[in-house]
Interface confidence: medium
């Protein structure tokens, strides 16, 4: 261990100023997973990057820490840097989608991803597919794949045809369709974590 | 503020090659994609391909794939097009832009200027 | 590849008055949730210029007078009321399916 630790500093301290300041406020109100609480405001406002990785990993632990704050990052717009902080702390696995090279790896995290441990419901409540489709598109979809699922007559016929493209994704991939997730339907993501 | 800057006009052989530039600004260069469109002096827009520079995945108009071809440089946020075996049909402006969601050129650059003469 | 018919290739509307431009396709670029067609605005010597993404979808800073409609083949790039700087060429694009192609244009004069 201690690599992700490393990880989340360097993320921290690659901020600036302001952006640090914005990323306390973000993670103040980012949804957290059960069983964890929150740093206290007075506390967080006040500390360096150096500290707050400190209270991050004694708060949440490393690995944890590392997914939260790569989520704040990306709140904030910071997907590059939160790909390689993902990167950085996690090791490879999967393949990429054909005839596109995968996103920084970033899988082997325990237990299954969201969007496989959610397949069902997603497939069922999914509305706004093409959305999604947009945003993965030319980074895990080809247009070969993009254009069958787009071809599916109905919402539930179109996510199934998507889900049969995961099994070659990577992690980092899946964090892809997730976070196209939480931006256009983000009532159904937070209702499927608090499940 | 999102900007697209490409290289100065081109002035070349025919038979010969050109590779041009499109340098990117003001946004997170891995999150979209670049097309390349030509317009040839008093006509209309023709789409050549794009390239999404986040992995390096590219598609070309069939029409191009002999002609075109796109790359990209992650590190000075800069896409580049080569065109090779060039004839007089090849002068044109070229333009690069943006590819935004659903797909529509959200953001344009100036445009290169590509003149092919012996 | 899908063809882009614009009708009028030109056209010519006083100071105030609504400019219609059509674009037809040769096969329908609409799904259930959008249609895949673009309008573009370009003036001599600039790049174009983005208005209408996905049909109906004004493009911020793009003033309220323009606006586009239209589902399956048939689309349509409105001007209402027309302005001396509306004067310009107009273009439709597809992005249903590789290769993208654009319209052939229509320039719009100002009387």
């Known amino acids: 261990m201690g690599r992700a630790r490393d990880a989340i500093l360097d993320a921290l301290e690659n901020l600036t100023a302001e952006e640090l300041k914005k990323f306390k406020l973000k993670l103040l109100s980012v949804p957290l997973r059960e069983g964890y609480g929150r740093i206290p405001r007075g506390a967080l406002l006040s500390m360096d990057a150096l500290d707050l990785t400190d209270k991050l990993v004694s708060f949440y632990l490393e690995t944890y820490g590392a997914e939260l704050t790569a989520n704040v990052l990306r709140d904030m717009g910071l997907q590059e840097m939160a790909g390689q902080l993902q990167a950085a702390t996690h090791q490879g696995s999967g393949a990429a989608p054909a005839g596109i090279q995968a996103p920084p790896q970033s899988a082997a995290k325990p237990g299954l991803h969201f969007i496989d441990q959610h397949r069902a419901a997603l497939i069922a409540r999914v509305t706004n597919v093409e959305w999604l489709l947009d945003a993965l598109y030319g980074k895990v979809l080809t247009d070969e794949q993009y254009q069958a699922v787009r071809a599916e007559p109905t919402n539930p016929s179109k996510m199934r045809k998507l889900f049969s493209f995961t099994p070659a994704w990577n992690w980092t991939c899946k964090d892809l369709l997730l976070q196209a997730l939480r931006e256009s339907q983000s009532y159904l993501v937070e209702d499927l974590e608090r499940s | 503020e999102v900007q697209l800057q490409q290289s100065g006009a081109e002035l070349v052989r025919p038979g010969s090659s050109v590779k041009m530039s499109c340098r990117t600004s003001g946004y997170t260069f891995t999150n979209n994609g670049i097309t390349w469109v030509k317009q040839r002096p008093g006509q209309g827009l023709e789409w050549i391909g794009y390239?999404?520079?986040?992995?390096?995945?590219?598609e070309y108009n069939e029409k191009f794939k002999d002609k075109a071809t796109l790359t990209s440089d992650t590190a000075s946020s800069t896409v580049y097009m080569q065109l090779n075996s060039l004839t007089s049909e090849d002068s044109a402006i070229y333009f690069c832009?943006?590819?935004?969601?659903?797909?529509?050129?959200?953001?344009w650059a100036q445009g290169t200027t590509l003149t092919v003469s012996s | 590849d899908i063809v882009l018919t614009q009708s009028p290739a030109s056209l010519a509307v006083s100071l105030g008055q609504r400019a219609t431009i059509s674009c037809r396709a040769s096969k329908s670029v609409s799904s259930s949730a959008y249609s895949y067609m673009h309008w573009y605005q370009q003036k001599p010597g600039q790049p174009p210029k983005l208005l209408i993404h996905?049909?109906?979808n004004l493009e911020s800073g793009v003033p309220a007078r323009f606006s586009g409609s239209g589902s399956g083949t048939d689309f349509t790039l409105n001007i209402h009321p027309v302005e001396e700087e509306d004067a310009a060429t107009y273009y439709c694009?597809?992005?249903?399916?590789?290769?993208?192609?654009f319209g052939g244009g229509t320039k719009l004069e100002i009387k």
């Open positions: 694009q597809h992005s249903w399916e590789l290769p993208y192609t």
């Open positions: 390239i999404y520079v986040g992995n390096g995945y590219t």
């Open positions: 996905l049909a109906s």
């Open positions: 832009a943006r590819l935004d969601r659903g797909r529509a050129l959200d953001y």
